[in-house]
């Protein structure tokens, strides 16, 4: 807190410009109208101001505007934005997404700090869904944005939105996200043909149902391994040899460097010897020739 | 980040002179903008004294003008602050900083003490 001087004879500021930087922070104080810096905000951004001074500007606007800055102030707020605490943030009304990329500008090269998440936050919100364009938006800044969200905040991304997913945006998500995901992106890309849809959904198939992947062997996708290793045990498990095989193409030999990690080595351990024999891998655990299967979760759900 | 290197602070009587001396590690210093701050005591704030852009145009405190030059040598990645006429006020720590908005990076200083 700077105490209230008097500005000095011929120092009051006529201006925002780089003279400012000579004013210790008790000059700033009582030399700088506040009206005049909220509307020359723009030119704050390009003067080397210290982080101390930047505190005093910041100081002069919060007594200007104690409900929340408007959002001309906040679009132009540049490196002031690294002064803002959450609680700052959670008093303003961002609608523009100008706006949001202004201030995620400045804080870019950076992990995705509190008040980031909070203006992130404020202007999801404030939209009411995460539309294409603010989902291209925030994963350009932060490509793990989206994995960051829970599977509750993830049920209100519009299908059309999925379209500005890139691969490496889901890397960091979990089983329940894809979960959520999946079925979205399976809409979004429902119309496109089978290599060119399988490029698309191969990211999301972490989320992916049984009869899904059952109906992608049928269309020789060649998935890969890495693909492979990453899809729901549950749904993975029903898979017959046959249909793995074709799911895979070519790619059906690293079984083999897989068979001790899930979901291979369950998937192994339901499957019969003679028919795991077949893709001559040499992947051992399979249910012995003549041992009968009793599938009891059919028995239960008959009873 | 750019590594900034202050040197050539010390005792000196009033009256008496310094000459500064700011290294930086970064190629193409010449375009950046430089400055020298002083800081009287730790805690207390920094105080921009003088500055020096690209072309080589200078701007002072009151406190300082007709007393201290900026200078630089793009060779040498090196902005000097001549001290003259020094007084005990100008006694601190002193800093150079790349003057880019947004950059509050700072050397270690280096110590003037004018004892009268």
């Known amino acids: 807190e700077v105490e209230k001087t008097a500005c000095p004879s011929g120092k009051k500021a006529r201006e925002i410009d780089e003279s400012l930087i000579f004013y210790k922070k008790w000059e700033l104080e009582a030399c700088v109208d506040a009206a005049l810096l909220a509307t020359q905000m723009d030119r704050v951004n390009a003067i080397p101001f210290t982080y101390e001074q930047l505190d005093v500007l910041k100081h002069k606007l919060d007594e200007l505007y104690p409900q929340g800055y408007p959002e001309s102030v906040i679009q132009h707020l540049g490196y002031l934005f690294l002064k803002m605490s959450p609680e700052d943030i959670r008093k303003w009304n961002v609608t523009s997404l100008e706006t949001l990329k202004a201030l995620l500008e400045v804080n870019k090269g950076h992990e995705m700090s509190p008040q980031v998440a909070t203006l992130i936050d404020r202007f999801v919100k404030g939209r009411g869904q995460l539309d294409k364009d603010t989902l291209d938006t925030l994963t350009a800044f932060y490509p793990g944005y989206l994995c960051s969200l829970s599977p509750e905040e993830l049920s209100s991304v519009p299908p059309s939105s999925i379209w500005a997913v890139r691969p490496q945006d889901l890397d960091t998500c979990d089983p329940r996200q894809l979960d959520v995901l999946y079925p979205k992106a399976r809409l979004a890309f429902q119309n496109m043909n089978g290599s060119e849809y399988f490029v698309k959904i191969q990211s999301f198939l972490g989320g992916a149902p049984t009869e899904d992947l059952k109906a992608l062997s049928q269309q020789n996708v060649s998935m890969d391994l890495a693909t492979f290793m990453k899809l729901r045990t549950d749904a993975v498990l029903p898979l017959t040899v046959a249909e793995v095989q074709k799911l895979l193409g070519p790619h059906v030999e690293g079984l083999k460097a897989e068979e001790r990690h899930r979901p291979v080595r369950d998937w192994i351990l339901r499957q019969r010897q003679d028919d795991l024999d077949t893709l001559g891998l040499g992947l051992q655990g399979g249910i012995p020739n003549g041992y009968l299967v009793l599938d009891l979760s059919m028995q239960e759900a008959l009873s | 980040q750019v590594q900034l290197v202050e040197s050539g602070g010390g005792l000196v009587q009033a009256g008496g002179s310094l000459r500064l001396s700011c290294t930086a590690s970064?190629?193409?210093?010449?375009?950046?903008?430089m400055g020298w701050y002083r800081q009287e005591a730790p805690g207390k704030e920094r105080e921009l004294v003088a500055t020096i852009n690209r072309f080589g145009s200078t701007n002072y405190a009151d406190s300082v003008k007709g007393r201290f030059t900026i200078s630089r040598d793009n060779a040498k990645n090196t902005v000097y602050l001549q001290m003259n006429s020094l007084k005990s006020e100008d006694t601190g720590v002193y800093y150079c900083?790349?003057?880019?908005?947004?950059?509050?990076?700072w050397g270690q200083g280096t110590q003037v003490t004018v004892s009268s």
């Open positions: 900083r790349i003057m880019r908005p947004g950059n509050w990076y």
């Open positions: 970064e190629s193409g210093f010449s375009a950046n903008y």
